[in-house]
Interface confidence: medium
């Protein structure tokens, strides 16, 4: 394990509230409560970095859940793999985030003999707010029915504490489920994995899905990488050493926006992570006067922005006064450039008043940390030369 400059590594039990998808149930976002059972997942003795907040942390005690409808408890040992984002799962509550967790049966495309000797489950965990997402494949040994405790619906043996004991043999994770990058910049889409000794890495595949179309972006198999999207790179050395399958996309265009799927296939298992990549382009603003007539018209040109949503506000400030919002602006038709960015113009009839006034066109857009504005002074006709 790595040695951090500060803090100590400590092994803790990470307990998560989950749902177990019932066998044969339709798995998806709209699964009904009848299709899912309550479950708990206990990741046993996960090494996490203790920043001092784990002092009163106690390990999971089995059999303490006295409820009418007790959840199925999965105990998963992580001795065979690494869970690098365990801290995020552990501290989610404290940082005001939620962890969603769904467990489902995982079926191997293996011979009947192998399948009869063990059962597999997949656990998908996601930290809200764009945090990490982890997919685990857990294996439970299947033993004979003369065990004292047996789960009737799972058809699996239970430990003396009434839990289903499993070992995590494979995990695929991303640190960020959603990313935003500026048009033209370079993006790195994070995808890491860890597998039990004895498993071999077979392939890595990155796919992009956007507006109903799907396409291969990059594939690595049998030691050979192939970029379908020009410039896409994945560092083969990192695959073997760091178990890092992150994808780098240089020179982002609007066509790169969408849902990326990182799929890792080993000799036994396959799992994936989904990452949403959003492209942004910041607007540019120009403010000018249409004419120098009695009531001049101000034109605010806004160009080169993406995505579409933009808010334009006008304010007027007389000398010595405070800015006041002005209504009555009109908009030109929206234009889209070859690159996919948008442009629009907003116009406003200016009323300079007796002493003149400063007009500001302010643009608010998701790509901007703060609104972008352009101001210009409009003087009364008698003061113009």
């Amino acid at each position: 394990k790595p040695h951090p400059a500060e803090g100590q590594w400590r092994a803790v039990d990470v307990v998560l509230d989950c749902f177990l998808a019932k066998d044969g149930a339709h798995r998806g976002a709209l699964a009904s409560s009848e299709d899912r059972a309550r479950a708990s997942l206990v990741l046993k003795q996960v090494p996490v970095l203790d920043d001092g907040s784990l002092e009163d942390f106690t390990d999971f005690q089995g059999g303490t859940l006295a409820q009418d409808d007790p959840p199925i408890i999965f105990e998963a040992s992580v001795d065979l793999v690494q869970i690098p984002q365990a801290e995020a799962l552990l501290h989610a509550d404290c940082s005001g985030k939620e962890v969603t967790c769904e467990i489902s049966r995982y079926f191997l495309q293996m011979t009947e003999t192998t399948v009869k000797t063990a059962a597999w489950f997949m656990a998908n965990m996601q930290v809200s707010g764009g945090g990490p997402s982890i997919s685990l494949v857990m294996k439970t040994p299947r033993v004979t029915k003369n065990e004292a405790l047996w789960h009737p619906t799972l058809n699996l043996p239970l430990s003396p504490q009434g839990t289903v004991r499993t070992a995590v043999e494979f995990q695929v994770m991303t640190q960020t489920q959603s990313l935003s990058f500026l048009l033209g910049s370079s993006a790195s889409l994070d995808c890491g994995f860890s597998m039990a000794p004895g498993l071999d890495l077979i392939s890595v595949e990155w796919r992009l899905q956007h507006k109903g179309r799907g396409q291969l972006v990059y594939s690595w198999t049998a030691g050979q990488g192939q970029a379908v999207r020009k410039g896409a790179t994945l560092e083969p050395a990192q695959l073997g050493m760091a178990r890092d399958a992150s994808l780098t996309l240089p020179g982002l265009t609007i066509q790169d926006e969408g849902t990326y799927i990182c799929q890792i296939t080993t000799s036994l298992y396959r799992a994936q992570q989904i990452i949403q990549l959003n492209i942004q382009a910041s607007p540019k603003v120009r403010l000018s006067l249409a004419n120098e007539a009695l009531l001049p018209t101000l034109i605010c040109d806004i160009a080169g922005y993406y995505p579409l949503d933009v808010v334009v506000t006008w304010t007027r400030e007389e000398l010595g006064g405070s800015p006041a919002q002005v209504s009555g602006a009109s908009f030109s038709s929206l234009r889209q450039s070859v690159a996919g960015t948008y442009s629009i113009s907003s116009s406003l009839t200016a009323e300079p008043g007796s002493a003149g006034a400063t007009y500001t066109c302010q643009v608010t857009h998701i790509s901007l940390e703060e609104p972008l504005g352009a101001s210009t002074q409009v003087v009364p006709p008698e003061r113009r030369t």
């Epitope: 249409a290 040109d301 160009a303 901007l368």
Partner: antibody
Amino acid sequence: DVQLQESGPGLVKPSQTLSLTCSVTGYSLTSGYFWHWIRQFPGNKLEWMGYISYSGTTNYNPSLKNRISITHDSSKNQFFLNLNSVTAEDTATYFCAGDDWDWFAYWGQGTLVTVSA
Amino acid sequence: ENVLTQSPAIMSASPGEKVTMTCSASSSVNYMHWYQQKSSTSPKLWIYDTSKLASGVPGRFSGSGSGNSYSLTISSMEAEDVATYYCFQGSGYPLTFGSGTKLEIK
């Protein structure tokens, strides 16, 4: 390729009007760019004077607002600078420039204007 | 108006040396742009939108910064980089230029 060329008198008397023309080739003035006048004083300080947009709208530097006028003639693909009531302080090299939202991507070669009696 | 202060005013560097010049704005701006001007020629757009290189600009040039503080860096000085570099802001009117950094070669 967009090209700009300044022309006009190299010597102007104080209190008179400085008039310069910028001829644009390779792009139509009304197609979507912004067309600026910028000057560089003898000490190399650069000053933005103002622009006229593709739609004919204008914006001027407040320090020149009462003296400056920028117009265009789309039929000749030219835009113009008029600066009245000039003084010796207006002695500078005057550049016309065009931009496609990426500020002054295209420049003329500049023309030196001396204000002197 | 937004005053842009460039430093140093004059600097010299040996071939291969890393060069960094800065531009400080009296008011925060969204982007900074840079122009290169060689003697007796018009300025050329060199870096726009803080960090994007204009067409034909060598990859040894880079731009960075945010808010009130921006910089232009040359990773390895070459003789052809001798020029005056001006920063420029287009976020607020009037549009303003910095006073320039004159880069010489040792």
